[in-house]
Interface confidence: low
Amino acid sequence: TERLCHPCPWEWTFFQGNCYFMSNSQRNWHDSITACKEVGAQLVVIKSAEEQNFLQLQSSRSNRFTWMGLSDLNQEGTWQWVDGSPLLPSFKQYWNRGEPNNVGEEDCAEFSGNGWNDDKCNLAKFWICKKSAASCSRDEEQFLSPAPATPNPPPAGSGGGLNDIFEAQKIEWHEHHHHHH
């Protein structure tokens, strides 16, 4: 087993101290939260302009509508991140023109084109998970060591849609090493 340090799990993307997973399947907003929790992460909470630019680019490049961890479900018009922090007033510059418009109970935020849009939370979209990168100071899953042959299955009753995450964690280390330098 090689002891090369890699700060993120396989098929996660590293950016400024955090790891991001861009899903390849689609879920509604609430199930996207669950998907991220099941891999020890959180539906993405954006904390800096640099992070926003990075994530917006990922989303627009792939031309995907992608959930972020932001909604006004608790109180109409009061946007809040899934970690409980409020949407700062200056974030509003990232909404697409005319958004959020709350047409037909649109209470969850997505990356859409070059900005943000509010949409119905029950719609299936791609999602982005975020968690802190490993420090590489101790032996963790993030080291480039062979993956277990079979990852733990999702908890009973959690439904499908996590295959892309779990499959990602089955990639053999040498394939990963070949593709990630």
Epitope: I46, K47, S48, A49, S85, P86, L88, S90, F91
Partner: antibody
Amino acid sequence: QVTLRESGPALVKPTQTLTLTCTFSGFSLSTSGVSVTWIRQPPGKALEWLALIDWDDDKYYSTSLKTRLAISKDTSKNQVVLTMTNMDPVDTATYYCARTPSGSYGRYFDLWGRGTLVTVSS
Amino acid sequence: DIQMTQSPSTLSASVGDRVTITCRASQSISTWLAWYQQKPGKAPKLLIYEASSLESGVPSRFSGSGSGTEFTLTISSLQPDDFATYYCQQYNSYWTFGQGTKVEIK
């Protein structure tokens, strides 16, 4: 070069209304993400945030002073005006205007004016 | 409203000392915290934003850390120009300043 300059009366009488103007250059309050704020500091005391206005004319006021404050902007003149009604001697302070930079998620204040001292006395 | 409490209120130190100022928030503010330096008769100057990001032009001896409710400003080696009053400010929900910490010559 970005500058902000506060102007207004140095002395106001109790119960009067104070009007302060912040004139700025080097940036535009029509630029997305930019805002201008007012902060005051009584002699020898701490800073106190008063009000803020965004590029899109959204306004925010200190909870304890919101009934007395009004903030407005004139984008063409590069000015932000603060009015404070029913002035009292405890409102004696140096009043500063400051800017929130464009594109910053955090609403910190990166550039400040020199401040103008307002004394409330009869 | 979120309250910000700084400690100590006054700090006596010598040139070359490592100085640490603490700021506590009454509720979690994530990393939405700034530090300012103010000298007598002058406007405050931004040092640190987002808890740990150094403002352009600020000497690297200044650093910030913390998240949630506990934050620190550290001056690694105090210089003559650093004797001043320092304020923390939260911008998680509206804007609130701490009461200030005066760094004076020992």
